[in-house]
């Protein structure tokens, strides 16, 4: 079975700058999963951002402000980055990672 | 000092539009979310709009959504409000308010700064 | 939309004594997402308290916030003549960002 790991316990960003987070994917070829991002802000739900499946298919959730999150995924390192643009006081959330095996 | 100072605000007929601006200074602007509050004359406030301070998160109350477009500056220091197909209803003082920051409780989010407002009228 | 119902509507006291005002949400708010203000006639409102609890930059200590989940009160230990005008409560959410409690008008008895 495939398990995650998200090596950044946090991260600190200056506002308008980037911030690159991580998920590390193990037991299983990241290439035949699908790799999900979520965030969740204080006091409030969890929110699906984007995700990006096994044939490396982008899908961001409607509502989203475009430009905003970008999603990749590096085979040699089996890792897969949410890249957050113009960091913002509104991005100031737990941001999570999850799997769905092909 | 911390200042906003808000313009733009008059009679306008129905159907009509405005531009409202809110000028800000003393503090460093693009750090900020910024936001429209209303008050209708004897009525209680009530929020307007919301932008991010990279002007990435927009939001609108219900009865603005569709005639009201917010907007930002962040090199000239200024806050828009474009207010399109006005209504005898939009009649209130229009504030500019800065939201607090991310300094200290960073997770909190509360006006601290406002302007002394602008007056819109909508009659005709 | 969680709507905010303040209470009473008018508050009548005198000069000295205590005022204790509430604010009920219709669902549960986070408590970093609640704030107070004062709004006195002619003028613009003024934070008070931030966060439920916290006080804002330059607000005497005689005001208090206090509550969680659907129930908040803001209180003032002693009141003063400048203490007198309109509170509003008001919360953060995410649809729509922020809504308003429709006041106590504190009034002098």
């Known amino acids: 079975a495939g398990h995650l790991e998200q090596p950044q316990i946090s991260s600190t960003k200056t506002l308008s700058k980037t911030a690159r987070l991580e998920c590390v994917v193990s037991g299983i070829t990241i290439s035949a999963t699908s790799v999900y991002w979520y965030r969740e802000r204080p006091g409030e739900v969890i929110q699906f951002l984007v995700s990006i499946s096994y044939d490396g298919t982008v899908r961001k959730e409607s509502g989203i402000p475009s430009g905003k999150f970008e999603v990749d995924r590096i085979p040699e390192t089996s890792t897969s980055t949410l890249t957050i643009h113009n960091v913002e006081k509104q991005d100031i959330a737990t941001y999570y990672c999850a799997l769905w095996e092909v | 000092e911390v200042q906003l100072v808000e313009s733009g605000g008059g009679l306008v007929k129905p159907g009509g539009s405005l531009r409202l601006s809110c000028a800000a200074s003393?503090?460093?602007?693009?750090?900020?979310?910024m936001n429209w509050v209303r008050q209708a004359p004897g009525k209680g406030l009530e929020w307007v709009s919301s932008i991010s301070s990279s002007s990435s998160y927009i939001y609108y109350a219900d009865s603005v959504k569709g005639r009201c477009t917010i907007s930002r500056d962040n090199a000239r220091n200024s806050l828009y409000l474009q207010m399109n197909s006005l209504r005898a209803e939009d009649t209130a003082i229009y504030y500019c308010?800065?939201?607090?920051?991310?300094?200290?409780?960073?997770?909190?989010?509360?006006?601290?700064?406002w302007g002394q407002g602008t007056m819109v009228t909508v009659s005709s | 939309e969680i709507v905010l119902t303040q209470s009473p509507g008018t508050l009548s006291l005198s000069p000295g004594e205590r005022a204790t005002l509430s604010c009920r949400a219709s669902?549960?708010?986070?408590?970093?997402?609640l704030a107070w203000y004062q709004q006195k006639p002619g003028q613009a409102p003024r934070l008070l308290i931030y966060?439920?609890?916290s006080r804002a930059t330059g607000i005497p200590d005689r005001f208090s916030g206090s509550g969680s989940g659907t129930d908040f009160t803001l209180t003032i230990s002693r009141l003063e003549p400048e203490d007198f005008a309109v509170y509003y409560c008001q919360q953060y959410g995410s649809s729509p960002p922020y809504t308003f409690g429709q006041g106590t008008k504190l009034e002098i008895k």
């Open positions: 669902q549960s708010v986070s408590s970093s997402y």
């Open positions: 308010a800065r939201d607090r920051g991310i300094g200290g409780d960073y997770y909190s989010y509360a006006m601290d700064v």
């Open positions: 966060g439920a609890s």
């Open positions: 003393g503090f460093t602007f693009n750090s900020y979310d």
